[in-house]
């Protein structure tokens, strides 16, 4: 067991007398804060520079009679290297300079062994060597260079950044590690709290627009800042961040731009730029047109990249209507800081004068499209109608008209180049083509490059110039045993004309066939007619085929009629009326053919 001399013992240890005692640099450090006194401690000064080994203390066993029979052995941290023991006397020495900051405590074990028996005379005892601090370390900042920001125009005492320096010396002993901060460079702009290292603003109205960067040098000194203390420094680079303390300002009060009257909506006319000494969002500018005759004719948009106001055309301009516009444009900050409103409104106005330039425009037709009508029986050179185009320019240049021949390859129509009258140059047929779509060109006589086109839609009106005809070729049959007034075929007619009130056809047997006919025609008054038998029974051996001439007439003016022939064959039929033979010729049933059986 290990102990200090009995005079330094405190109560609480085992009653059994300790045989292995410890004496030397052990100290009863009752005054030291946070550290209870330990009986088994040696204290050793760090960074000892003497020429001899530094004496630590002495181990002694009660059983040591001084005859050299006891051997003292040291083991643990640094034993045999940093710390050596005189195996006969128990004296402990430190062989090297010790650095508390490298290792503040060494834990060693002591043994006293009887050389003659090889047996330990005591159990192993543990003791501590504490390295006593000296002020051999300067404060070191956690960063060589700090970077910080603080808003411009901040109140005095605004927190900027906290710098921290650490001192490797013992903070629990003396002032070797008690650090005090001071400012070496950066006054009168900034100050530092000596205890905390908090840097604050020290000057009112620091304006970023005036100066943006500050380099502050802070010193940390130990020994509470007293003379003889060690010190370290750090650099703090402080940047003033922007606040919106500057309004936008137009560099000139009036701007003038020109734009051709032909500029379509959305066309940029020009750019205006208000300058703002602030940066970032504080320098963002919104432009608006607040007044002027062009309020509804122009727009202003903000270019987000350049913070310019772009004046654009909102509606179509007309030089002939208005040649000059005056606008009032306002530039304002969208992000305003209320505390700076006392500096005045964060906006500015300028006058923008826009001159509309005349553009030689092509002729303009009185209509976007023309629809004309003409009867299909119109003679050549019949006038259909006319078109009108005018030069919109102030000059009112004369115009000549022409037909775009790509749209009238057959040259059916012509136009009077002077007055725009459209007339026929060929006969028309509605049944061939109902609509003619042509394009008329109006060209300025003095400037043939200026031309416009307009579509003409010409409708050909119907004239009754086509006779009705059978809808199909009719060939039917009649059974030999047919009864009188039997329907053997229904007739239908078609007409190429398109009368206003619709078709009304009449059917009749041709006059030459009407008397003594074996068949009759019955007009159904619905544009169909039926062929009926006129007698009972037919003899195919007497007459195998009948040809019936039928006259079909319309009721339009002038009346048109045509004669069509219906062929009727006489056939042998079974008792169901199904055809069996017709003179050994096979009769093909046309589609829709009624047998009339």
């Amino acid at each position: 067991t290990l102990s200090t001399p009995l005079s330094k013992r405190t109560s609480g240890f085992p009653a059994k007398k300790r045989a292995l005692e410890l004496s030397g640099n052990s100290k009863n450090e009752l005054s030291r804060s946070k550290r209870s006194w330990m009986w088994n401690q040696f204290f050793l000064l760090e960074e000892y520079t003497g020429s001899d080994y530094q004496y630590v203390g002495k181990l002694h066993s009660d059983q040591d009679r001084g005859d050299g029979s006891l051997k003292y052995i040291l083991s643990g941290d640094g034993a045999g290297d940093l710390f050596i023991i005189n195996e006969n006397t128990g004296d402990i020495q430190a062989t090297k300079r010790l650095d508390r900051e490298e290792k503040p405590v060494y834990i060693l074990r002591a043994q006293a062994i009887n050389r003659r028996t090889g047996r330990p005379v005591e159990p192993e005892s543990e003791f501590i060597i504490k390295i006593h601090d000296i002020n051999d370390n300067e404060p070191i900042f956690t960063k060589e260079v700090y970077t910080a920001t603080v808003p411009e125009m901040s109140d005095v005492g605004t927190f900027v950044v906290q710098v921290t320096a650490t001192d490797a010396d013992d903070p629990t002993y003396g002032n070797s590690a008690k650090v005090v901060y001071s400012i070496l460079q950066g006054q009168p702009y900034f100050s530092v709290e000596s205890e905390t290292g908090i840097i604050k603003t020290a000057l009112l109205n620091m304006d970023r627009e005036n100066r943006e960067q500050y380099q502050v040098v802070i010193q940390a000194k130990d020994m509470g800042g007293q003379m003889g203390g060690l010190s370290g420094t750090t650099t703090v680079n402080i940047t003033l961040t922007d606040v919106n303390d500057n309004p936008p300002r137009f560099p000139q009060s009036t701007y003038q731009f020109k734009t051709p009257e032909s500029s379509p909506p959305g066309t940029p006319i020009g750019r205006i730029k208000a300058s703002d000494a602030d940066v970032g969002e504080n320098a963002e500018i919104e432009y608006s047109i607040t007044d002027g005759e062009g309020l509804d004719m122009f727009d202003v948009i903000t270019d987000q990249e350049t913070q310019e106001g772009i004046i654009t055309v909102k509606k179509l301009l007309d030089f002939e209507k208005k040649k000059v516009y005056t606008l009032k444009v306002e530039a304002s900050n969208p992000h305003v800081e209320p505390r700076f409103l006392y500096l005045g409104p964060f906006k500015d106005s300028a006058t923008v004068r826009i001159v509309v330039e005349d553009v030689d425009e092509p002729p303009v037709f009185s209509k976007l499209a023309y629809i004309l009508q003409i009867r299909e029986d119109a003679q050549i050179n019949t006038t259909i109608g006319s078109v009108t185009a005018q030069d919109p320019d102030a000059a009112r240049n004369p115009v000549k008209y022409s037909v775009d021949r790509h749209t009238d390859m057959d040259r059916i129509f012509n136009i009077d180049s002077g007055n725009g009258s459209i007339f026929t140059s060929k006969l028309l047929d509605r049944e061939t083509l109902l609509w003619h779509n042509i394009t008329v060109i109006a060209t300025e006589i003095n400037n043939p490059k200026q031309s416009s086109r307009v579509p003409l839609y010409i409708k050909v009106l119907d004239v009754n110039d086509n006779a009705p005809e059978f809808a199909e070729f009719y060939e039917t049959f009649v059974c030999e045993k047919a009864k009188a007034d039997q329907l053997i075929q229904t007739l239908r007619a078609v007409d190429k004309d398109d009368p206003y009130s619709g078709h009304q056809f009449s059917f009749s047997l041709a006059p030459e066939a009407a008397s003594g006919s074996n068949f009759t025609i019955q007009d159904n008054k619905d544009n169909t007619a039926g062929i009926l038998t006129r007698k009972n029974g037919y003899n195919r051996h007497e007459m195998s085929t009948y040809l019936l001439p039928v006259v079909i007439s319309d009721n339009d003016y002038p009346v048109q009629s045509s004669t069509g022939t219906v062929t009727v064959r006489v056939c042998a039929c079974d008792h169901h009326g199904n055809m069996q033979s017709c003179h050994a010729e096979a009769l093909i049933h046309p589609t829709g053919l009624s047998t009339g059986a």
Epitope: K71, Q111, R115, R116, G118, E124
Partner: antibody, heavy 119, light 106 residues
């Protein structure tokens, strides 16, 4: 070279006594205590006691007091152990051993003496 | 007296295998000593003051423990390590030995 040379084996009758010797060489005989150890056949070791050759002071294991007597002869660097009132329980190998701490700890043993107690 | 109990009494290990044997004291001792004994030979000092190797003992051996619990460890068993190992205390008279652990090679 350190050597502890023990006397030869002994065959003795029950009730008799025997004296075993241990001659030390290779070191200063008086510098280190001499220990005696018993090892019965197939069994463990038992410490009998030790003697300081300097002054003939002895320490015994209570179990062997009255059974063993330790002596030394400094002039011949020899240690002796006498065993009396022998019984079959005393049949064993008896070894002398010297332990000490010089530069490092050491322990030297004799080769052992077999004592057989038999009628 | 202090009784030292060794376990296991008998054990076998393959070459290269790690081996640990223990010695338990009936009451606390300051240090433990270990001896190696091979058949027909005297014991040899092996470990002293709990963890120190005696002269000539291979570094694969180590000792540790305190109070009532101690152990001897061989990091990598070799054939020559086959023997009986005894623990012993010098803390209290009578100075007693353990009953031994016999270590065999597989």
């Amino acid at each position: 070279e350190v050597q502890l040379q023990q006397s030869g084996p002994e065959l003795v009758k029950p009730g008799a006594s025997v004296r075993i010797s241990c001659k030390a060489s290779g070191y200063t005989f008086t510098d280190y205590y001499m220990n005696w150890v018993k090892q019965s056949h197939g069994k463990s070791l038992e410490w009998i006691g030790d003697i300081d050759p300097n002054n003939a002071n002895t320490t015994y294991n209570q179990k062997f007091k009255g059974k063993a007597t330790l002596t030394v002869d400094k002039s011949s660097s020899t240690a002796y152990m006498e065993l009396r009132s022998l019984t079959s329980e005393d049949s064993a190998v008896y070894s002398c051993a010297s332990f000490g701490y010089d530069v490092e700890w050491f322990g030297y043993w004799g080769q052992g003496t077999l004592v057989t107690v038999s009628a | 007296q202090i009784v030292l109990t060794q376990s296991p009494a008998l054990m076998s290990a393959s070459p290269g295998e790690k081996v640990t044997m223990t010695c338990s004291a009936s009451s606390s001792v300051s240090y433990m000593y270990w001896y190696q004994q091979k058949p027909r030979s005297s014991p040899k000092p092996w470990i002293y003051l709990t963890s120190n190797l005696a002269s000539g003992v291979p570094a694969r051996f180590s000792g540790s423990g305190s109070g009532t619990s101690y152990s001897l460890t061989i990091s990598s068993m070799e054939a020559e390590d086959a023997a009986t190992y005894y623990c012993q205390q010098w803390s209290s008279n009578p100075f007693t030995f353990g009953s031994g652990t016999k270590l065999e090679i597989k």
